[in-house]
Amino acid sequence: DSGISPRAVWQFRKMIKCVIPGSDPFLEYNNYGCYCGLGGSGTPVDELDKCCQTHDNCYDQAKKLDSCKFLLDNPYTHTYSYSCSGSAITCSSKNKECEAFICNCDRNAAICFSKAPYNKAHKNLDTKKYCQS
């Protein structure tokens, strides 16, 4: 369970909209497969689900950084700087270590989403049935 910090969720949402204009990220990419949404277990059901598993793992790595320890205590303090130009996302060089790490987690996931096919059958999947470890 990566327990994505709320503020990262809002910025992540906009990152996805940057690379996939017209998308509705909370509608499309929350509760998809075994890993898109809060938590995750089992084997990813498709490429998009793998993007989410990688994103979860990336957040788990972030939490191991000394500079990211505050994420465990007060996730609302977390934010980062980035820019969206066309459909290109750039994480700002002004970000500190933790912000830079998380920004890249979100950036890589958004790009991954943009390249992965979307399978409607995997939206709101029965995780108890299909996502057992």
């Epitope: 709320p6 969720v9 809002w10 909209k17 940057c18 909370f26 809060l38 980035y82 969206c84």
Partner: antibody
């Protein structure tokens, strides 16, 4: 401090095309991943989100209005515009431009004072 | 679309008493455990003013007399105690879906 100000023709005839302007001061509309929206107040009591243009220039329009509406911008003047085709009396409303929040969520922190559009023959 | 239904449409409250406004969503507005519901105050001739964001967070500069609560589909704006300056129309708004929608408004008057 960022400020937004709407302007428009005021009174127009049915079936005409209308353009409303929003002038932004204190912040570039191309910076910081803000989304710049048009919202209208119909019949003095119903708020309706019309659409937005993002800092990178992409747009999203309310599907119920999509066939008649476009949103554009002029970066050099730091303005964005609402273009409304084939207006009817139902488009009579106060039109606001607004900016979303500094934390990245889609609630509206900054509003203009509004411009009134009346459609009448 | 997520339809937001506010109740009552209007209410009259005595000065110093509590005003409670309800907003019900046609489907949950929660994502990642966060409620994407916001509240505004609008006075005649003025634009809406943000009061509460994400269900319960008080916007900077707004008096603590205003509070918000709720989750998923049921949300409440409370004003306690009501003051003369609170006469206005109050709106809820959801940002859970990218088609942002507002409630129909609740007009608050002083008894």
């Amino acid at each position: 401090d960022v400020q937004v100000q709407e302007s428009g023709p005021g009174l127009v005839k049915p079936s005409q095309t209308v353009s409303l302007n929003c002038t932004v001061t204190g912040h570039s509309i191309t910076d910081d991943n803000y989304y710049w929206s048009w919202i209208r107040l119909v019949s003095g009591s119903k708020l309706e989100w019309i659409g937005y243009i993002t800092s990178s220039g992409s747009t999203d329009i309310n599907p119920s209005l999509k066939s008649r509406i476009s949103i554009t911008r002029d970066i050099s003047k730091n303005q964005f515009f609402l273009h409304l085709n084939s207006v009817t009396a139902e488009d009579t409303a106060t039109y606001y431009c607004a900016r979303d929040s500094t934390d990245g969520d889609f609630y509206f922190e900054k509003w203009g004072q509004g411009t009134t559009l009346t459609v009448s023959s | 679309d997520i339809v937001l239904t506010q109740s009552p449409a209007s209410l009259a409250v005595s000065l110093g008493q509590r005003a409670t406004i309800s907003c019900r969503a046609s489907e949950s507005v929660d994502n990642y455990g966060i409620s994407f519901m916001h509240w505004y105050q609008q006075k005649p001739g003025q634009p809406p003013k943000l009061l509460i964001y994400r269900a319960s967070n008080l916007e900077s500069g707004i008096p603590a007399r205003f509070s918000g609560s709720g989750s998923r589909t049921d949300f409440t704006l409370t004003i306690n105690p009501v003051e003369t300056d609170d006469v206005a129309t109050y709106y809820c708004q959801q940002s859970s879906r990218d088609l942002f929608t507002f409630g129909g408004g609740t007009k608050l008057e002083i008894k």
